[in-house]
Structures are given as structure tokens and as C-alpha cells.
Interface confidence: medium
């Protein structure tokens, strides 16, 4: 029988009455156009909703927008359009919400064609009040807040000027012209690329990368012949044109661009691309596109310097630059990532890694599922997850995979069970152990969200027909209750809950359609009375993450340590609460060779865990030599995997070899620039 309909599913008592008392409807006095919603601050309950409606007239487009504010998690809304002088707000810029709990909001207004500059509305009190400010430029991008100081804003203008404000958008100063891309780094540093001659597009590969650490008073050139740059974790990456041809290579810096080393990655040609899939302070996942229009490439994982890379996964699906990849960081369990590969027969398969890219495997077949028509052997198949690529292909997949750091071990995703991803209507699957095992949770496609750190999962069926029913589970998706939240079904457009999955409120957004008009409507349901009491110690149980063999002393060891978590028992119906903190107990593991990667100049022969020295470095390998400070050029053959905390056990010490004797780098130094003008 379908999940949730078994005899042993206990029902939550009196839930209909409890939810009915906590269901709040708000009908918006708007013609249906588009709606965008933003949360302002953390645990403040403040939501801003911007509705916009376009009427295409013969000569121009007439636009109208309205701004609404809630301070009770969406239960009630107040029309505050008058605070922004009934101005039409540009939705493509969204609502620029300040970092942390700064309470800052910037809205960018539509202005008439002949105006000198744009217009913004600024609030620093969680949208209670707004100040109108006319800009000395027309913005090309949304205002970007410095992560360190929410008073510092930067924006690019339509004329490629880089503008900075030091007083939360009150006064603006153009600190540089001819800027292509600008990003905040740490400590209020700004990195940007600039062109000398034609334009960003024309000068691609001949850009310079500059840095300012004092908001434009002084500058430092940190890169030349730049194609693009990116920031990830503590790493700064630049893709740099090679001297002799049209290929480019990745260079990496860990000191904000003062010194650079060439990453040990293949170079790419004009039609190829690099992409930082994920980065933290320890390491980087880098995708390198294959030559030709293959739609796939290779994932490499870095060492702690971002310089030496190990091949992690072949035939990784990634369509084009800025295209689609299914690469997903499973945030509910350390070291877990899911992505898709394009197999030789052009079918798409899901792969999962539990050790930060060290090994990839197929997802285990859910026990309560049959293999579908894609399976050659009906008894042996895997779960395949639908993510961004499936959504881009307009398959019946309303949502990407979902995991939350404070809902330990829980992963929810659409999928199919077979030898590859199926184009048939998918079902929803859940894992409660970070992706090791899976269970079918719901039949058919659904929208889903996690509330109260995993204490409640909410779902709504994906349907083209109007809906009025929401499903919820208090036991990590084993059993489901249904609640009719309105008599009059609505055309559903989205679920909204406060980011961070700590809230117990869910908002259901949609519109009603009558003969003459259609209106936006939201229903906010508070589940606080379903979880009547606060969780106590007895409601939690100890769980060892990454456990695959309880008999083994090293069971659960991933990246040199294991972690035991206190997790809510599935049978406990109680509130984790907004202040819930994940309780975990780490313990260090003994080192094995698996805790080390091979350093530059060394490799692992097939089925061998030892790193052996490459017989000689010649030909193509010359390009992989390290460049920069002296310590980059010494190695003992092994290097601890980034973030690995193992101690004792195997300690692979080697004599230090000076690789300078073996090769020279072709890292682009200014001496090697062409003397011809670009």
C-alpha cells in the first residue's frame, strides 16, 4: 500500500481543529501578474511581498507594483506601497535584502527614459520606513552588500562604471570605469575585471583583475590576460589566457591575489569552460568541460591549497557555460554530494559521494520500489534523482532535491528507480541517513519543505488543477496526514517557509480565478499546536553518521573522524524549537592511506592506495608544475585530504623532493606577455 495508509500509522490527534485555528488567509487586492517574496532578517517574522502587473500598450509597457509587509510570518499583510510613493519597482533586480539581521532592504525603481540616473528606496528598519534616493547612474545589477558591513554597497552601471556607497546607498561614488564584473571579497575588499580597449566581450581574455581594499581609494593589479574570475571559500580563481594560443588555464590564490599558482588542471579552449561547483575553506570541486559540444566534463577535487587536483568523476553532466548541472551539496550530512553523469548510451544516471568526492557510487535502490522499464535486470537497479537538468528539460519535476543542515540526515528528492533517469512521472523519495538508504515517500510529483529542523515535513501535490489540500508528516515522511486548508481550491504557485527550516509556519501561495478577475492569495498555516510540547532528552536518540558496518572499529569514519548525532525519534511528536542546535559528538579516527591524496608529481596506480612518483615529468605534465613561493615546490608525495582530521595510524613520510629540478612552470608572468598590443 502507499506510504501513509498503513495500519501502523498513528494519526496526530485533533489535527484538523488545531490547524484550522492556525490557518490565516490573505487575499491581495491585485490583478495577477508576478509575485516575489523575501524574508527580512532571521527569526523576525518579517516578509516583503512585491506584486507587479504589466499592461503592454501599443507604444510602451505600463507597469504597476504593490508592496506588502508581514511581521507575523505571513499570517497578516499590510499594503505599504505608499511608503515607496506608489513607484513601479523593477522585479529583475528583486529585493536586495541586507546580510545577517541588518534589517536593510533596497528596492530599485523603474524610471522614465530621459532620467539622469536610477532611483532606489532604502530601508534600514526591516521595511517599516523607506527613503527615496536618486542615483547618479543607471544600475545594471542589483546592489551588492559587503558581507562584512551592510552599509557598504556596490553596483555596476549600464555604462560599465563601478559605483560604491559607504552609507547604505545615500551617496554614491564611481570608483572605476570600464568594469565587467565586480565581487566583494573578505574584509570589504572588492575584486573586479576591467577592459582597456573595446568592451567586456571584445576584451575577454585581455581583461585585468584589480583589487581595492579601501573602497576605491587605492588599487592593485593582481591579474593580466584574464578571461574571468571567481571566489570560492578562501580561494580566488582566475582563468588566464595562455601566451601562444586561445587556451586558458586556472590560476589560484589564497592571499587575495598577492601571489598565484597554476592549478594542476587541464587547459580549456574557446568553447569550453571551468565551473566551481562547490568550495569551502578546505577545498574546491571544479568542473572542467570536455572539448566539443558533449554536455559533460570531469569533476576534480582540490588539495588544501587549491593547486593539486585529483580526478573525482568522469562524464559529469553539465550542459553549457551557465547551463545546467545536477551537482548538489547534501547539507544535512558532511561529505555528501549528489550529481548526474551522462553514460555512453546518452542516458543520465545519478551518482553519490559520501567522502567529499573520493569515491562515487550509484544510489541504493529503495526497498519499497520496483525497477522501472529502464532497468535491464528487474532485480538490480538504482535510484536516480531529478535535479536542475530535469527541471530545465520541463519534466514533471516541480522541485530540486532538498536538505537542511539542521535536519540531520534528511534528503528529499524526486526520482525514478531503474538504470537511468526516466522521463516518466517521478515519485518523491526520502533518505534519513544522508543518502545511504532511500524510501518512497510520496506517489507522484510534489512540492515539499522541511519545518522545525525536520520535526515536520510538508508537501503539496503538483497538479495543473486547483488544489486545497496540504499533506504533512511528523515522522520523517513515513506517515502522512492530509488537511484541507480552504473550501475554495486555488491555482497553486509555491510554498514559502522561512529559510533555515526552523520555522513552524508554511505559506501556500496561489491565485483564484473568477469570470472577470484573478487575485493573489496566500494561506499561512502554523503547525505549533500540532507539536504541542517541547522535545525533551528522551525524544532524542544517538545516531552514528556514515555507519555502514557496525562491527568495524572504523565504522562511520569519513575524512578522518566520525560523528554521533542526537536525532529526534520518528515516534516523537514534539517541537525542536527555533533555538534547536544540532548536538554532535566527533571522534578522531586512525589515519590510513585513504586519508591522503597524491601530491603533484605522484600518482596512484589502479587498485593501489600507495602514491608512486611519476617516472618523469615531460610533455603535457610540464604545464602542471607549481609556481610561486618556495614551499609550493616541495612535496613528500602525499598530502592530507582537505578537512581530514585523522591522527596516528599510517603516516606516509617521504623524503622531500625539490620539483624545481624536474620542471619549470609556464605560469603567466608579465615578462611573458606578448609585446604586441591587444
Amino acid at each position: 500500500s502507499a506510504p501513509g495508509e498503513d495500519e501502523e500509522c498513528g494519526r496526530v490527534r485533533d489535527f484538523v481543529a488545531k490547524l484550522a485555528n492556525n490557518t490565516h488567509q490573505h487575499v491581495f487586492d491585485d490583478l495577477r501578474g508576478s509575485v516575489s517574496l523575501s524574508w527580512v532578517g532571521d527569526s523576525t517574522g518579517v516578509i516583503l511581498v512585491l506584486t507587479t502587473f504589466h499592461v503592454p500598450l501599443v507604444i510602451m509597457t505600463f507597469g504597476q507594483s504593490k508592496l506588502y509587509r508581514s511581521e507575523d510570518y505571513g499570517k497578516n499583510f499590510k499594503d505599504i506601497t505608499d511608503l515607496i510613493n506608489n513607484t513601479f519597482i523593477r522585479t529583475e533586480f528583486g529585493m536586495a535584502i541586507g546580510p545577517e539581521n541588518s534589517g536593510k532592504v533596497v528596492l530599485t525603481a523603474e524610471v522614465s527614459g530621459g532620467s539622469r540616473g536610477g532611483r532606489i528606496f532604502r530601508s534600514s528598519d526591516f521595511a517599516k520606513n523607506f527613503v527615496q534616493t536618486d542615483l547618479p547612474f543607471h544600475p545594471l545589477t542589483q546592489m551588492m552588500y559587503s558581507p562584512q558591513n551592510s552599509d557598504y554597497l556596490l553596483a555596476l552601471s549600464t555604462e560599465n562604471g563601478l559605483w560604491v556607497s559607504k552609507n547604505f546607498g545615500g551617496k554614491w561614488e564611481e570608483i572605476h570605469k570600464a568594469v565587467c564584473l565586480a565581487k566583494w571579497g573578505s574584509d570589504n575588499t572588492i575584486f573586479f575585471t576591467t577592459y582597456a580597449n573595446g568592451s567586456c566581450k571584445a576584451d575577454l581574455g585581455a581583461l585585468e583583475l584589480w583589487r581595492t581594499s579601501d573602497l576605491g581609494k587605492s588599487f592593485k593589479t593582481i591579474g593580466v590576460k584574464i578571461y574571468s574570475f571567481g571566489l570560492g571559500g578562501r580561494f580566488l580563481f582566475a582563468s588566464v589566457m595562455a601566451d601562444k594560443d586561445t587556451t586558458r588555464r586556472i590560476h589560484v590564490s589564497t592571499d587575495q591575489g598577492d601571489t598565484w599558482s597554476m592549478a594542476q588542471l587541464p587547459s580549456v579552449g574557446q568553447e569550453q569552460f571551468y565551473s566551481i561547483l562547490a568550495a569551502n575553506d578546505d577545498m574546491v570541486f571544479m568542473h572542467v568541460d570536455e572539448p566539443g559540444d558533449t554536455g559533460f566534463g570531469t569533476i576534480f577535487t582540490s588539495d588544501d591549497r587549491g593547486i593539486v587536483y585529483s580526478k573525482s568523476l568522469d562524464r559529469h553532466l553539465y550542459t553549457t557555460t551557465g547551463g545546467e548541472t545536477d551537482f548538489t551539496n547534501v547539507t544535512s550530512l558532511r561529505g555528501v554530494y549528489i550529481t548526474s553523469v551522462l553514460s555512453e548510451d546518452n542516458s543520465i544516471q545519478t551518482m553519490i559521494t559520501f567522502d567529499q568526492g573520493g569515491r562515487w557510487t550509484h544510489l541504493r535502490k529503495p526497498e519499497n520500489s520496483e525497477c522501472d522499464a529502464t532497468a535491464k535486470n528487474k532485480n538490480e537497479c538504482s535510484l536516480h534523482i531529478h535535479a536542475s537538468y530535469s527541471i530545465s528539460q520541463k519534466l514533471n519535476v516541480p522541485m530540486a532535491p532538498l536538505s537542511e543542515p539542521n535536519a540531520v540526515g534528511i534528503v528529499i528528492a524526486h526520482g525514478s528507480v531503474g538504470d537511468a533517469i526516466s522521463v516518466m512521472v517521478p515519485d518523491v523519495y526520502i533518505s534519513d541517513d544522508g543518502g545511504y538508504s532511500w524510501t518512497k515517500m510520496l506517489e507522484g510529483p510534489h512540492y515539499y519543505t522541511i519545518l522545525d529542523s525536520g520535526g515536520i515535513i510538508v508537501a503539496i501535490e503538483h497538479s495543473s488543477r486547483p488544489i486545497n489540500v496540504i499533506k504533512f508528516s511528523t515522522d520523517e515522511g513515513q506517515c502522512w496526514q492530509t488537511y484541507t486548508f480552504t473550501r475554495d481550491p486555488i491555482y497553486f504557485t509555491g510554498l514559502a517557509s522561512e529559510p533555515g527550516a526552523r520555522s513552524m509556519n508554511i505559506s501556500i501561495w496561489g491565485f483564484t480565478e473568477s469570470f472577470l478577475t484573478s487575485q493573489w492569495v496566500s494561506y499561512t498555516i502554523d503547525f505549533k499546536d500540532i507539536l504541542e510540547r517541547n522535545c525533551e532528552e528522551k525524544d532524542y536518540t544517538i545516531w552514528l553518521a556514515h555507519s555502514t558496518d557496525p562491527e568495524d572499529y572504523e565504522d562511520g569514519c569519513i575524512l578522518g573522524y566520525k560523528e554521533q548525532f542526537l536525532r529526534l525519534r520518528k515516534s516523537s511528536v514534539c517541537q525542536n524549537g527555533r533555538d534547536y542546535v544540532v548536538t554532535k559528538q566527533p571522534s578522531i579516527c586512525l589515519c590510513s592511506l585513504e586519508d591522503f591524496l597524491c601530491d603533484f608529481g605522484y600518482y596512484r596506480p589502479e587498485n593501489d592506495s600507495k602514491c608512486v612518483e611519476q617516472p618523469e615529468l615531460k610533455g603535457h605534465d610540464l604545464e602542471f608544475c607549481l609556481y610561486g613561493r618556495e614551499e609550493h615546490l616541495t612535496t613528500n608525495g602525499y598530502r592530507k585530504i582537505p578537512g581530514d582530521k585523522c591522527q596516528g595510524g599510517v603516516n606516509p613520510v617521504r623524503e622531500v623532493k625539490d620539483l624545481k629540478k624536474k620542471c619549470t612552470s609556464n605560469f603567466l608572468s608579465p615578462e611573458k606577455q606578448n609585446s604586441k598590443s591587444n
Epitope: A196, S218, S669, N674
Partner: antibody, heavy 124, light 107 residues
């Protein structure tokens, strides 16, 4: 040998413009930044800006922004510095100086080769 | 802008003396500091780059030290041809800035 040869002395009226040239020889012109530094009579050294002759990128000191233009002609290995709207306090010796190249990407390991200097006098 | 403060602004010394000139930056400039010598009517000449590296062709009696904000130029044994004005210069960031100069005169 490596040398920078600058154009001759100039006398200009206030409000006029001056264009000083600096011809490089003995090295690859495009591979080194060219800086311009001036020195008023009896005063210290004042940096005006640089040009990367390879790409044409320039960077000017804020004080001269809007008045100075640095250009180059790679075909004849020559850098130019033009200063407009001259005032009497622009009277100085103007030097071009080659940026000593590091093995990294910086403006700065000093200026290792200097031109002989061009005296510009601004007087009504 | 980064201010470079040189001291002393002038000093008198004899041939054979050990001479020390200091330069302080208003903020850290790592080791991006260079020293120049200038004689009347001549262009400056690079002596030390990157705080302590001796430019080729410069006598070994010149040495530089320091990093961050405090730097020193030392002439171990002053020679007749060393009487000149010395400038420090930071090249960490643009705008590049020079110290006010130290004039070394014959005692």
C-alpha cells in the same frame, strides 16, 4: 643597452596642454609598465600614473585624473604623457620610468630604468 | 593614499660612516618598498627593491630591511659618491607614493 629617451624641454602658457614622449630601446617594450613621475623644483618625487604598453591599461593618480592621458605606440616603442589645462604649479621635470618586472602580477618592484627627464615650464 | 614618512629629512656624515635612513608607511605594505638615490640634475636610480633585494649593479654597501610599516636603508660605509638625496617608495597599491626624501650631506 636598455634606455629611455625623452623629448625636449617645453615652455607652455597656463591652460595649454603638453605632450611628452618617451622612446624605449634595448628591451621588449610591451613587457614592462611605463610609469610617469614628476619633480617640481626643489621638491620630492610625485607619481602620476602608469600605462601597460602591452594592453593599453592605464592607472592615474587621483590628483591628475581628468587632466592626464597616457598612451603608447607599440610600433615605435614609445610612450606618451599628455597633461592638459596646465597651471603654473605644473612646472616640473617629468620623468618616464620603466617598472621593474616581478615574476608575479604586480605594479611594483620599483622603477629600474629612468628617462633623462623633460623640463616643462608653465608661465604666462 | 598611503603616506610615506622618511626620517631624518637630512643628515651630515663623513666618508666611512655607517648611515641609516628610516621610512614608515601609514599602513602595512608587506615588503613592497623600494629605495632610490638621486643626485642633483639627474634622474633617480633604483638601489633596493622589495625592501631588501639589491638592484644589479648597486654596490653591496647598500642594504635594506623591514616589512609591514617600518623599513630601513643602511649604507655600511659611506663613500664620496653616496652624497645624494634618498627616497623610499611604496608599490603595494596605486597610487604609488614616495617619501619626502633624506638629503645626505658631507660633514
Amino acid at each position: 643597452q636598455v634606455q629611455l629617451v625623452q623629448s625636449g624641454a617645453e615652455v607652455k602658457k597656463p591652460g595649454a596642454s603638453v605632450k611628452v614622449s618617451c622612446k624605449a630601446s634595448g628591451y621588449t617594450f610591451g613587457a614592462y609598465y611605463m610609469h610617469w613621475v614628476r619633480q617640481a623644483p626643489g621638491q620630492g618625487l610625485e607619481w602620476m600614473g602608469w600605462i601597460n604598453p602591452n594592453s593599453g591599461f592605464t592607472r592615474y593618480a587621483q590628483k591628475f585624473q581628468g587632466r592626464v592621458t597616457m598612451t603608447r605606440d607599440t610600433s615605435i616603442s614609445t610612450a606618451y604623457m599628455e597633461l592638459s589645462r596646465l597651471r603654473s604649479d605644473d612646472t616640473a621635470v617629468y620623468y618616464c620610468a620603466r617598472g621593474k618586472r616581478s615574476s608575479g602580477w604586480y605594479e611594483g618592484y620599483g622603477m629600474d630604468v629612468w628617462g633623462q627627464g623633460t623640463t616643462v615650464t608653465v608661465s604666462s | 593614499d598611503i603616506q610615506m614618512t622618511q626620517s631624518p629629512s637630512s643628515l651630515s656624515a663623513s666618508v666611512g660612516d655607517r648611515v641609516t635612513i628610516t621610512c614608515r608607511a601609514s599602513q602595512s605594505i608587506s615588503s613592497y618598498l623600494n629605495w632610490y638615490q638621486q643626485k642633483p640634475g639627474k634622474a633617480p636610480k633604483l638601489l633596493i627593491y622589495a625592501a631588501s633585494s639589491l638592484q644589479s649593479g648597486v654596490p653591496s654597501r647598500f642594504s635594506g630591511s623591514g616589512s609591514g610599516t617600518d623599513f630601513t636603508l643602511t649604507i655600511s660605509s659611506l663613500q664620496p659618491e653616496d652624497f645624494a638625496t634618498y627616497y623610499c617608495q611604496q608599490s603595494d597599491v596605486s597610487p604609488i607614493t614616495f617619501g619626502g626624501g633624506t638629503k645626505v650631506e658631507i660633514k
